[in-house]
């Protein structure tokens, strides 16, 4: 048998946010139901994780031997602390789209570990704020965006923006 440390060396995690409790659940991406040491995990999920607090999970299973895999869960900031904002200026709304993620609340997570990504059509931007210019008037554009914490996606949003009519004579 392999050690659990080896077997789960490359385990990945998805973070799911509960807006009512303001707590995260970490979903462990494994094929079998594992045990989580002191942390109880049901159906490979570790519940009630506080934003921006590290949690250590000891992963074991009867298919592997000691030592267990120690997984550090680096819990992201609360999702409600981020808002996708349309920053397009009214006078330029016929040919311009502006979108930015606003941090309406502070949090204790390291901002260095946060990555923003926008995809509008086939254009990809790794920025917190984007401005698309020289667009077609009266066209519909879809922009998908996501925020990652330590390369784990923890929230996403989409905006469908229709550019205004062009000015007469343009």
């Amino acid at each position: 048998k392999p050690t659990c440390d080896e077997k789960y060396a490359n385990i990945t995690v998805d973070y799911l946010y509960n807006k009512e409790t303001k707590l995260f659940t970490a979903k462990l991406n494994v094929n079998e139901n594992v045990q989580c040491g002191n942390n109880t995990c049901t159906n490979n999920e570790v519940h009630n994780l506080t934003e921006c607090k590290n949690a250590s999970v000891s992963i074991s299973h009867n298919s592997c031997t000691a030592p267990d895999k120690t997984l550090i869960l680096d819990v992201p900031p609360g999702v409600e602390k981020f808002q996708l904002h349309d920053c397009t200026q009214v006078e330029k709304a016929d040919t311009t789209i502006c979108l930015k993620w606003k941090n309406i609340e502070t949090f204790t997570c390291d901002t260095q570990n946060i990555t923003y990504r926008f995809q509008c059509g086939n254009m990809i931007f790794d920025n917190k704020e984007i401005k698309l210019e020289n667009l077609e008037p009266e066209h519909e554009y879809k922009c998908d965006s996501e925020i990652l914490y330590n390369n784990h996606k923890f929230t996403n949003a989409s905006k469908i923006i229709k550019t205004d009519f062009g000015s007469p004579g343009e």
Epitope: C87, C98, K100, K102, N103, I104, E105, T106, T111, Q112, I114, T115, Y116, D126, N127, K128, E129, I130, K131
Partner: antibody
Framework: EVQLVESGGDLVKPGGSLKLSCAAS????????MSWVRQTPEKRLEWVAY????????YYPDTVKGRFTISRDNAKNTLYLQMSSLKSEDTAMYYC????????????WGAGTTVTVSS | DVLMTQTPLSLPVSLGDQASISCRSS???????????LEWYLQKPGQSPKLLIY???NRFSGVPDRFSGSGSGTDFTLKISRVEAEDLGVYYC??????????FGGGTKLEIK
């Protein structure tokens, strides 16, 4: 190491122009809003310009509006302050400072660069 | 514009004593989102300002717990429970609620009696 380094300060005559630079390193510059703050010889701190992370939004107090222009080059990790029609009251130490968003705080400051406006 | 008035201008203290600095805004700096964006910065001689407190009472990381902030509406206070030599310098309050018209207080110089 997270660092901001200002440069470009000089002695300039009233009515003259000057461009300050702030080189950022050690962090994802394009994710941070940035500001210029100055300190007068009397040691008063005054906020003079603000720019959002992507350069979309800029703000100025009335004292410098129309004379100062803040800009940034995220590819070069550099913040700028173009100052024109300079007055003697613009004499100060100019600091650049980062602020993750408008509702956050100035958590990193540069060491400053000195601007003296005098004939 | 929001005017931030600090008192006293100069505060002579003995090491180990408590120090208290007041900051008053000319109008309420409670934002419509319910938060109050009042910050305190310390500038030591020959250095740039450093953040101590944000949102009235939250200590920034690495700031000793002898520093505490309090207040609401228009009246705010920074307290240092036991002044140490490294605390000497000029303290500035700052309001960030009326975005983007940020304003600093005039400063309070903490010095040895």
């Amino acid at each position: 190491e997270v660092q901001l380094v200002e440069s470009g300060g000089d002695l300039v005559k009233p009515g003259g122009s000057l461009k300050l630079s702030c080189a950022a390193s050690g962090f994802a510059f394009s994710n941070y809003d940035m500001s210029w703050v100055r300190q007068t010889p009397e040691k008063r701190l005054e906020w003079v310009a603000y720019i959002s992370s992507g350069g979309v939004s800029t703000y100025y107090p009335d004292t410098v509006k129309g004379r100062f222009t803040i800009s940034r080059d995220n590819a070069k990790n550099t913040l700028y302050l173009q100052m024109s029609s300079l007055k003697s009251e613009d004499t100060a130490m100019y600091y650049c400072a980062r602020r993750y968003d408008v509702w956050w705080y100035f958590d990193v400051w540069g060491a400053g660069t000195t601007v003296t406006v005098s004939s | 514009d929001v005017l931030m008035t600090q008192t006293p201008l100069s505060l002579p203290v003995s090491l180990g004593d408590q120090a208290s600095i007041s900051c008053r805004s000319s109008q309420s700096i409670v934002h419509s989102n319910g938060n109050t964006y009042l910050e305190w910065y310390l500038q030591k001689p020959g250095q740039s300002p450093k953040l101590l407190i944000y949102k009235v009472s939250n200590r920034f990381s690495g700031v000793p717990d002898r520093f505490s902030g309090s207040g609401s509406g228009t009246d705010f206070t920074l307290k240092i429970s036991r002044v140490e030599a490294e605390d000497l310098g000029v303290y500035y309050c700052f309001q960030g609620s009326h975005v983007p018209m940020y304003t600093f207080g005039g400063g309070t110089k903490l010095e040895i009696k």
